[in-house]
Interface confidence: medium
């Protein structure tokens, strides 16, 4: 004689005003846990959203974003417009990264280039709107007499081919 509602399984709801105590969730609704008093309305993936997983009686639909947009928030609650690499999304749309900043993704904001000199290093490859700078060894590391991180290769005797 245990509480009937607590035994209504996922996919049903407790509706003891009808001929059945546990009634199946109506179309376009679900209950993911047992003992529910109501079924939840299925999420609809419309507009910029597209369906990744259909709703079932026991689980909600899951949405993705259509091409040209990407998901934001928990369970893809929002879709945000993609930009090109080297751009960021502003209120006025996609704008190129300002000089000294970059964005290597289709989402997010432009970030400043790494300041190599803060680590005592030099710029090996210049940054672009799409790529960060590549830092190389410090100028001191390249000066004559500086200890090398890797030992010099042994000299080969003439006439011997490499092993």
């Amino acid at each position: 004689l245990q509480d009937l509602c607590s035994n209504c399984p996922a996919g049903t709801f407790c509706d003891n005003n009808r001929s059945q105590i546990c009634s199946p969730c109506p179309p376009n609704s679900f209950s993911s846990a047992g003992g529910q008093r109501t079924c939840d309305i299925c999420r609809q993936c419309k507009g910029v959203f597209k369906t990744r997983k259909e709703c079932s009686s026991t689980s909600n639909a899951e949405c993705d974003c259509i091409s040209g947009y990407h998901c934001l928030g928990a369970e893809c609650s929002m879709c945000e417009q993609d930009c090109k690499q080297g751009q960021e999304l502003t209120k006025k749309g996609c704008k190129d990264c300002c000089f000294g900043t970059f964005n290597d993704q289709k989402r997010g904001i432009c970030r400043p280039w790494t300041n190599c000199s803060l680590d005592g290093k030099s710029v090996l490859v210049n940054g672009t709107k799409e790529r960060d700078v590549v830092c190389g060894p410090s100028p001191a590391d390249l000066s004559p007499g500086a200890s090398s991180a890797t030992p010099p290769a042994p000299a080969r005797e003439p006439g011997h081919s490499p092993q």
């Epitope: 509602c5 035994n7 546990c22």
Partner: antibody, heavy 113, light 111 residues
């Protein structure tokens, strides 16, 4: 927490009687699943009816009890069972139960002329 | 109305032994709504098992419920004198009328 039934009596066939189940140590203001079960002398258990307290849900009845027996919540600590047109076959100990795990000691109803 | 048929009474076993009580429902119980109750003379029933196999609070693990659909079993192992009682199965059904039904009970004797 405990339950106690009251109202059991010796009545004549055709009479009506109301049994009361009183809760101690808890109240029916929150949702509880309350049932009445009876047991004729030397016989087995027989389910009568159940109701959700604190809820407008339809009570559940055994088909033989529907129309002659009425279960209802009458206060935050009492559930009643109204019985009409009693016959000798209704002679039994009547138990109330909460969620199937808490039971009262029972009250005896005897129908005899 | 639903009918629950239990093992005929009495069932006898010695202290330390094992008894098995079967319960067959005339129709499938809903979502494993099956309970087992123990009753001693002059006392109300005591729930041992609910949802077919879940042990009620404070009940020794010597009591074990199993089964699904229409066939259920209560097994009592390491039998004690105190286990002498009548055991009832109760089934729950997904209908507002005749929601529950009890079996007729099985008396267990401990020798």
């Amino acid at each position: 927490q405990s339950l106690e039934e009251s109202g059991g009596d010796l009545v004549k066939p055709g009479a009506s009687l109301t049994l009361t189940c009183t809760a101690s140590g808890f109240s029916f203001s929150s949702r509880h699943y309350m049932c009445w079960v009876r047991q004729a002398p030397g016989e087995g258990l027989e389910w009568i009816a159940c109701i959700y307290t604190g809820s407008s849900g339809t009570p559940h009845y055994a088909s033989w009890a529907k129309g002659r027996f009425t279960i209802s919540q009458t206060s935050s600590t009492t559930v009643t069972l109204q019985m009409t047109s009693l016959t000798a076959a209704d002679t039994a100990t009547y138990f109330c139960s909460s969620e199937g795990n808490l039971w009262g000691p029972g009250t005896l109803v005897t129908v005899s002329s | 109305a639903q009918v629950l048929t239990q093992t005929a009474s009495p069932v006898s076993a010695a202290v330390g032994g094992t008894v098995t009580i079967n319960c067959q429902s005339s129709q499938s119980v809903y979502s494993n709504w099956l309970s087992w109750y123990q009753q001693k003379p002059g006392q109300p029933p005591k729930r041992l098992i609910y949802s077919a196999s879940t042990l009620a609070s404070g009940v020794p693990s010597r009591f074990k419920g199993s089964g699904s659909g229409t066939q259920f079993t209560l097994t009592i192992s390491d039998l004690e004198c105190d286990d002498a009682a009548t055991y009832y199965c109760a089934g729950g059904y997904n209908t507002v009328t005749d929601t529950f039904a009890f079996g007729r009970g099985t008396e267990v004797e401990v020798k």
